[in-house]
């Protein structure tokens, strides 16, 4: 799998999407994942609803929601309030029993907030943002790495 | 009708090759996962592996990873299980089976005939 | 993996009389079990998905309990189409697991 990485600005929400197959994933539940270390287990952080039928009901666990349309086949994570320690790699997975698939990994990268900037004049705004208050629509910038890169940084 | 058909009864000798067929029919044969199971002589099933035409995506039971491949043509909606170098222990009858998902579990709803490989010197 | 075991591995049963085969887990499977009938000679044919949904067209004398690691299939009045082999399957660990098998055959 190819790693997308999604960038969102502290302080803001960030919305992740992980595309499937709808057949492929007929049926199955879907959870959102943060990987701890490169080998390590994947951290389960929240889960689409027990009954597959209420997949679209938005779920929550702390500051993150995850909804899933299945029969469009696009599961969607939104992280509210997005913060420093958010940042980092995770995964979209498909659930079945005791096993579950990876339909995407994702690298979460979070910017520094343009309104900690003191300088008005040099403020940036995600999108093509008009107002102030358009500044804080949920937003994601996201791209696939690029062959090399890594996820993790080197341990020293 | 919804139906999988397998290719006939294969005799061979040990070394040789060998691919065998399932064609399905009556259904979106993409949307589907297709797996293999193996039935030795007078013994049980066996499960081997699994694949979704759709994307050729294929997993293997870890008795069988290395020792056949299961692939798929999704524009003649044909599964395909294959062998490079047959052994004696190959001998077996091969089925093909239609995996459906479903919000009350998954379901190897519906069967190929089965394909008898006879591997004899 | 998931062993399977099933018991007993024959059963001699009277037609009209009922049937209870039984499969047991390694491990809990919850609910991602399922049983299908196989006859001499022919491809297996699904009864039970999902532990407990008869697949279409099974009659109502197929009927499982159980879940987790014990599962029981009972026939509740032998017919003679039904002296067969049985099996069960788990579909909760990769990768899915047969059990041995059960043949149901006339007293």
């Known amino acids: 799998h190819n790693t997308t990485v999604f960038q969102g600005v502290a302080g803001q929400s960030l919305q992740v999407s992980c595309p499937y197959d709808s057949m492929k994933h007929w049926g199955r539940r879907k959870a959102w994942c943060r990987q701890l270390g490169e080998k390590g287990p994947c951290q389960r952080v929240v889960s689409t609803h027990n009954l597959w039928l209420l997949s679209f009901l938005r779920r929550w666990n702390g500051s993150t929601a995850i909804t899933d349309d299945t029969l469009g086949g696009t599961l969607t994570i939104t992280l509210r309030n997005l913060q420093p320690h958010d940042a980092g790699l995770y995964q979209c997975q498909s659930l079945h029993g005791s096993e579950a698939d990876t339909l995407r990994k994702v690298l979460v990268e979070v910017l520094a907030d343009p309104l900690d900037h003191r300088d008005a004049g040099d403020l940036w705004f995600p999108g093509e943002s008009e107002s102030f208050e358009d500044a804080h629509v949920e937003h994601s910038i996201s791209r696939s790495l690029l062959e090399g890169e890594i996820p993790f940084p080197p341990t020293s | 009708e919804v139906q999988l058909v397998q290719s006939g009864a294969e005799v061979k000798k040990p070394g040789e090759s060998l691919m065998i067929s399932c064609k399905g029919s009556?259904?979106?044969?993409?949307?589907?996962?297709i797996g293999w199971v193996r039935q030795m002589p007078g013994k049980g099933l066996e499960w081997m592996g699994i694949i979704y035409p759709g994307d050729s995506d294929t997993r293997y039971s870890p008795s069988f990873q290395g020792q056949v491949t299961i692939s798929a043509d999704k524009s003649i909606s044909t599964a395909y299980l294959q062998w490079s170098s047959l052994k004696a222990s190959d001998t077996a009858m091969y089925f093909c089976a239609r995996r459906r998902q479903g919000i009350w579990g998954d379901a190897l709803d519906i069967w190929g005939q089965g394909t008898l490989v006879t591997v004899s010197s | 993996e998931i062993v399977m075991t099933q018991s007993p591995a024959t059963l001699s049963v009277s037609p009209g009389e009922r049937a209870t085969l039984s499969c047991r887990a390694s491990?809990?499977?919850?609910?991602?079990l399922a049983w299908f009938q196989q006859k001499p000679g022919q491809a297996p044919r699904l009864l039970i998905y999902g532990a407990s949904t008869r697949a279409t067209g099974i009659p109502a004398r197929f009927s499982v309990s159980g879940s987790g690691t014990e599962f029981t299939l009972t026939i509740s009045s032998l017919q003679s189409e039904d002296f067969a082999f049985y099996y069960c399957?788990?579909?909760?660990?990769?990768?899915?697991?047969f059990g041995p098998g059960t043949k149901v055959d006339i007293k």
């Open positions: 491990q809990s499977v919850s609910s991602n």
């Open positions: 399957l788990q579909d909760n660990n990769w990768p899915p697991t």
């Open positions: 009556g259904y979106s044969f993409t949307n589907y996962w």
